[in-house]
Each structure stands twice: as structure tokens, then as C-alpha cells.
């Protein structure tokens, strides 16, 4: 035969009742026992587990004068703001002498209007771009059927007939509101209303139209913007920094960008005041009354080289017999590119001009024809880059060399 001590009679004279209500309800479970001698501590169980943090109070009333007489012990468990996690079977547990006693169970149930676990959130979407919205609700009682509404218009004939937890929207051309209704046997709860703001699509095909040393002309194709016309587009240019290395789609430039606004149409803009022969990254976003599109990826571009903007400086030319010594300094004005060298021209009063490419040197000794009797000799110097020659210096007369 199965082993086990015959249990003594249960000390419980009152067992927990049942509570069923909506979320947020406050209720009390109560159990009562009659014991002889010192009253035990009453513990509460939910689904067979001791409640470590129970909001319980215990009252003990002696039924006689002597400590060994009977006591009535009442334990009350307070449930504040009923939640799903509070539901289950409740019992009182006492340890009396050598034995463990458990009361008959009471039940706590939840029953009310549906409760939202997830509601649609405000968001921005690009025009005509698919997206999903989420809504989730629970009872009890179950089942809970959902009905989605767009701009207060139901998207299905009845709750539970259309999309449930996830609503797929193939695209919008105007800012719209979405909400969901949760229906169960107790009634209807309506979620918050989410505003879905329709922004312009990201512009496409950002490209260079023309290049000048200090300006770039760029163009792009605008994306769809729904029923909202584009008001302007914003172009940003930033100096490329090899150290930072802007990657395609990197969210922020490494420094404060140069920002220009373009009226649209046309979807084209001339960016000026740039550095010649300099790499830049550019991007564009377009704005409607609803807000800006996302930026395009950064596009690497480069301004071309220009010619030096000024002549070489401090030119001096001295003559000693049939030789002339000429030297100069780099132009102070911007070179607009990589200096490739200098050109020198000299000419007498009645003689043809002689042109020379000096390279990157900043001095030259000229061998003059004849005995050097050519009069009124003058020298001009110009710097050049791959883009061409810069301006020539003013003619500098060759002075006779005076020793010491």
C-alpha cells in the first residue's frame, strides 16, 4: 500500500474566495484558520509557489485567556491593480508542528475590455513606399479580434476579418492616421492614433553637369512626394578628408558642410566658392510641406585645376655682358592646382621674343646673342599648372650688372 502519514484535520475554517475583474481592479483574498496554541505564520501560494513579496496582513484573536487556548488567525492578501500576472490559483499555507497544511484554493481571474500590448506608432515614410504597422491586444476573455482603421475608416468589413497583428500598407501619397480597435466579448478598446507622415522619396541620380575650378554644377532626379509639391532641395558639400574617409551612406560628415538651397524646378544647382583641385563629397535632400526626404548617399566629386591667379613675385634680372641672371619667387596668389613650372620670355627693342620653359627652378642664366649690345631688354615670367599659364608678370628691364 502507498506510504504516507494520515493527515490531521485541516485547521482552515475559511478558504480564499474567487476574484474576477478587469485590469486595475483592487481586491482582497482571505483565509481563516483555528489553531490551538501559538498561531502560525500564514504564507500565500499562487499556482503552488510561495509568494515572496506578498502584500498580506495577519490578524490573530485569542478565543480564551490562556496562550494554549484556540486562536482564530485571519490572513488577507491584497491585490492592487490586477494584472494578468496576478491570475491563478491562490491558497494559504501553514506549518503546524510536524505538518504542512494548505487551504482549499481560490481563483483570481482577469476579465475585461481588451488590453493593448502593442499599439501603432507615429512614423515617417517616403511616398509610395511600403511599410508595416503593429497592433497587439489580449483579454481575457479571448478571443480578441482586431480591426484596423485608416483616417477613421475601417479597413475590413468586421473585426477579425482583415489583417490582425501586422498591417501591411503598400504605400501612401498623403499623410494619414491609423488606429486599431480590439474587440472581445466585453466590448471594444481603441488604440492610440498613429500619424504616418509622408515625406518625399530620396532624390536619385545625383551627378555632375559641369566643373569649374571654384564651382560645380550638379543635377538630380527628384523622388515622388505624394500630393505635396517639393518646396526646395538642399545640397551639402563637404571637403573630403582622407583621414575620415566618408563612406557611402555614412550618416554625418566629418566637418560642418557647406549648405545651399535650390528652388525647384529645375533640379540643378551651381555650387560656388569652392577650392580648386579639391575633392568634395556632395549629397542632396528634397523637402515638401511635410518635411525633408532622406539624404542621398555621399557622392565623391572633385573641382578641376585652374591656372595660377597671379604672376611670380619679386622678379629681378641683371645683365653681365652676354649673360643675364634672372630669379623670382612663387606667386602669392592661389595656384589653383599643382605648380608644374615657370615660363620666361625676354625681348629686346627690335628683336623677336624668346620663350623658355624653366621647369620648377626659380632662377635662370640666359645666354644673350651677340656681344650683348641689344638694348632695352625686358623679361617676363609666368607660372603654369596642368590647366595652363597664369598671368605674366610685368616686363622687368635687364639692368647692367654693377659689381660690389
Amino acid at each position: 500500500a502507498p506510504r504516507g502519514t494520515q493527515a490531521e484535520e485541516s485547521p482552515f475554517v475559511g478558504n480564499p474566495g474567487n476574484i474576477t475583474g478587469a485590469r486595475g481592479l483592487t481586491g482582497t483574498l482571505r483565509c481563516q484558520l483555528q489553531v490551538q496554541g501559538e498561531p502560525p505564520e500564514v504564507h500565500w501560494l499562487r499556482d503552488g509557489q510561495i509568494l515572496e513579496l506578498a502584500d498580506s496582513t495577519q490578524t490573530q484573536v485569542p478565543l480564551g485567556e490562556d496562550e494554549q487556548d484556540d486562536w482564530i488567525v485571519v490572513s488577507q492578501l491584497r491585490i492592487t491593480s490586477l494584472q494578468l500576472s496576478d491570475t491563478g490559483q491562490y491558497q494559504c499555507l501553514v506549518f503546524l508542528g510536524h505538518q504542512t497544511f494548505v487551504s482549499q484554493p481560490g481563483y483570481v481571474g482577469l476579465e475585461g475590455l481588451p488590453y493593448f500590448l502593442e499599439e501603432p506608432e507615429d512614423r515617417t515614410v517616403a511616398a509610395n513606399t511600403p511599410f508595416n504597422l503593429s497592433c497587439q491586444a489580449q483579454g481575457p476573455p479571448e478571443p480578441v479580434d482586431l480591426l484596423w482603421l485608416q483616417d477613421a475608416v475601417p479597413l475590413a468589413t468586421a473585426p477579425g476579418h482583415g489583417p490582425q497583428r501586422s498591417l501591411h500598407v503598400p504605400g501612401l501619397n498623403k499623410t494619414s492616421s491609423f488606429s486599431c480597435e480590439a474587440h472581445n466579448a466585453k466590448g471594444v478598446t481603441t488604440s492610440r492614433t498613429a500619424t504616418i507622415t509622408v515625406l518625399p522619396q530620396q532624390p536619385r541620380n545625383l551627378h555632375l553637369v559641369s566643373r569649374q575650378p571654384t564651382e560645380l554644377e550638379v543635377a538630380w532626379t527628384p523622388g515622388l512626394s505624394g500630393i505635396y509639391p517639393l518646396t526646395h532641395c538642399t545640397l551639402q558639400a563637404v571637403l573630403s578628408d582622407d583621414g575620415m574617409g566618408i563612406q557611402a551612406g555614412e550618416p554625418d560628415p566629418p566637418e560642418e558642410p557647406l549648405t545651399s538651397q535650390a528652388s525647384v524646378p529645375p533640379h540643378q544647382l551651381r555650387l560656388g566658392s569652392l577650392h580648386p583641385h579639391t575633392p568634395y563629397h556632395i549629397r542632396v535632400a528634397c523637402t515638401s510641406s511635410q518635411g525633408p526626404s532622406s539624404w542621398t548617399h555621399w557622392l565623391p566629386v572633385e573641382t578641376p585645376e585652374g591656372v595660377p591667379l597671379g604672376p611670380p613675385e619679386n622678379i629681378s634680372a641683371t645683365r653681365n655682358g652676354s649673360q643675364a641672371f634672372v630669379h623670382w619667387q612663387e606667386p602669392r596668389a592661389p595656384l589653383q592646382g599643382t605648380l608644374l613650372g615657370y615660363r620666361l620670355a625676354y625681348q629686346g627693342q627690335d628683336t623677336p621674343e624668346v620663350l623658355m620653359d624653366i621647369g620648377l627652378r626659380q632662377e635662370v642664366t640666359l645666354e644673350l646673342q651677340g656681344d650683348g649690345s641689344v638694348s632695352n631688354l625686358t623679361v617676363c615670367v609666368a607660372a603654369y599648372t596642368a590647366a595652363g599659364d597664369g598671368p605674366w608678370s610685368l616686363p622687368v628691364p635687364l639692368e647692367a650688372w654693377r659689381p660690389g
Epitope: Q6, A7, E41, L45, D47, G48, Q99, T100, P105
Partner: antibody, heavy 118, light 112 residues
Framework: QVQLQQPGAELVKPGASVKLSCKAS????????INWVKQRPGQGLEWIGN????????NYNEKFKSKATLTVDKSSTTAYIQFSSLTSEDSAVYYC???????????WGQGTTLTVSS | DIVMSQSPSSLAVSAGEKVTMSCKSS????????????LAWYQQKPGQSPKLLIY???TRQSGVPDRFTGSGSGTDFTLTISSVQAEDLAVYYC????????FGGGTKLEIK
């Protein structure tokens, strides 16, 4: 009087499944956890898992998670343990016991001897 | 998981001798809410199901002879048989029920 009644023996073939029963009486079945314990011949006691009849909430020893499934039938106050893909390693005595929240009294079934043999 | 370790795994004594066996848990078995230590000792005689001797580490189950005593706190527990009788031939298991159940490996008591 509290009783946990188990059949004395079961013989099954390797690879088969079996469902052992434990019929409870003499107390409120839904209010106490039922534990299952395994004992192979000449070996010690191993806790398999437990089930709370009211909610069918279960806990398992990791070692038995893929081997054993605990269920209850409240209407007949019976607890069950089902084994799948049986091998000779599953040959053992299986006890059901009523948990008393760490205290006393303590009730055990007499155990079912499961033999897996072809 | 709580691990229970018993020692020795077996011992042989003569009738009338005192016996102690040890059980160690990998963590404390004291429940702060109920202020109980969830450790039990079982006796299993050959061919029988286990029988509860001690619960709450030191409380003797009714009907168990007073030669059986449980002691210990925290993680170290001892079962003492003050004067072994021939009928005490059995395997003794400790069990924690602080968090689910775990049994120790058992101590086999033989009578010389």
C-alpha cells in the same frame, strides 16, 4: 486518506513510447505539485520533473527534457508521464510523489517498474 | 542548478554503534520567507520505496525512531544514527527542495 496509485509494471519494446499513470485520491488534486522520480536498478534517485495540476505548469530536469512529458487529467485526478524513443537506459522504477512545500506529510506511490526489452 | 554531494558513499558498522553521514549543497537551502531549511533525509530499504525520516534539516517525521537526528545549516548537513540497529540496513539519500528537487548520490549503510 491520501493515496497515489501506480501500476506495478510495464513492458515495452525499444523505440516505442509509453505513458505511466499516477492516480491521486484523498486530497485536493489541483493544489499540490506532483513530482516524478526515476531509480535504475542498484542506482540512486533522480528527479525527472514536476507538474502543478491546476495550471499544468511544469518544470523539468534538463536531462529528461527531451525524453519525458508530464501531463494531468484533472477530471480523473491522474498524473501521467510519457516517454518517447525508449531504450534500455529507460528501464527503471518510476515513482510519483506529492510535494508538500518542503514539509510533511510525505506521500509516494509504490512505483512502476518499466522494462524496455525486445 | 543546486548540486547535492553525499559522503561516504558506503559504510559498514556494527549494531549499537553511532553513525554519521554528510550531505553538502552547492548553495544555501534556507528560505527567508518561511524561515525553513528545505533539506530532507530519506531511507530506502531494499525493494521498498523511499521513506521520509527528516525534513527542514532537523524535524523528525512522526513515527521515526528518535535515534535518527538531522542537523546542519546553510550548506552542510548531517544525519546521525545514535545506535545502529539491524533494520537500519538501507541507502540514505538527502534531497533539497529549495529550488525544484535534487537528490544526493546516497550513502549505503551495511551492518557488520
Amino acid at each position: 486518506q491520501v493515496q497515489l496509485q501506480q501500476p506495478g509494471a510495464e513492458l515495452v519494446k525499444p523505440g516505442a513510447s509509453v505513458k505511466l499513470s499516477c492516480k491521486a485520491s484523498g486530497y485536493t488534486f489541483t493544489s499540490y505539485w506532483i513530482n516524478w522520480v526515476k531509480q535504475r536498478p542498484g542506482q540512486g534517485l533522480e528527479w525527472i520533473g514536476n507538474i502543478y495540476p491546476d495550471s499544468s505548469s511544469t518544470n523539468y530536469n534538463e536531462k529528461f527534457k527531451s525524453k519525458a512529458t508530464l501531463t494531468v487529467d484533472k477530471s480523473s485526478t491522474t498524473a501521467y508521464i510519457q516517454f518517447s524513443s525508449l531504450t534500455s537506459e529507460d528501464s527503471a522504477v518510476y515513482y510519483c510523489t506529492r510535494d508538500t512545500y518542503g514539509g510533511s506529510p510525505d506521500y509516494w506511490g509504490q512505483g512502476t517498474t518499466l522494462t524496455v526489452s525486445s | 542548478d543546486i548540486v547535492m554531494s553525499q559522503s561516504p558513499s558506503s559504510l559498514a558498522v556494527s549494531a549499537g554503534e553511532k553513525v554519521t553521514m554528510s550531505c553538502k549543497s552547492s548553495q544555501s537551502l534556507l528560505n527567508s520567507r518561511t524561515r525553513k531549511i528545505y533539506l530532507a533525509w530519506y531511507q530506502q530499504k531494499p525493494g521498498q520505496s523511499p521513506k521520509l525520516l527528516i525534513y527542514w534539516a532537523s524535524t523528525r517525521q512522526s513515527g521515526v525512531p528518535d535515534r535518527f537526528t538531522g542537523s546542519g545549516s546553510g550548506t552542510d548537513f548531517t544525519l546521525t544514527i545514535s545506535s545502529v540497529q539491524a533494520e537500519d540496513l538501507a541507502v540514505y539519500y538527502c534531497k533539497q527542495s529549495y529550488n525544484l528537487w535534487t537528490f544526493g548520490g546516497g550513502t549505503k549503510l551495511e551492518i557488520k
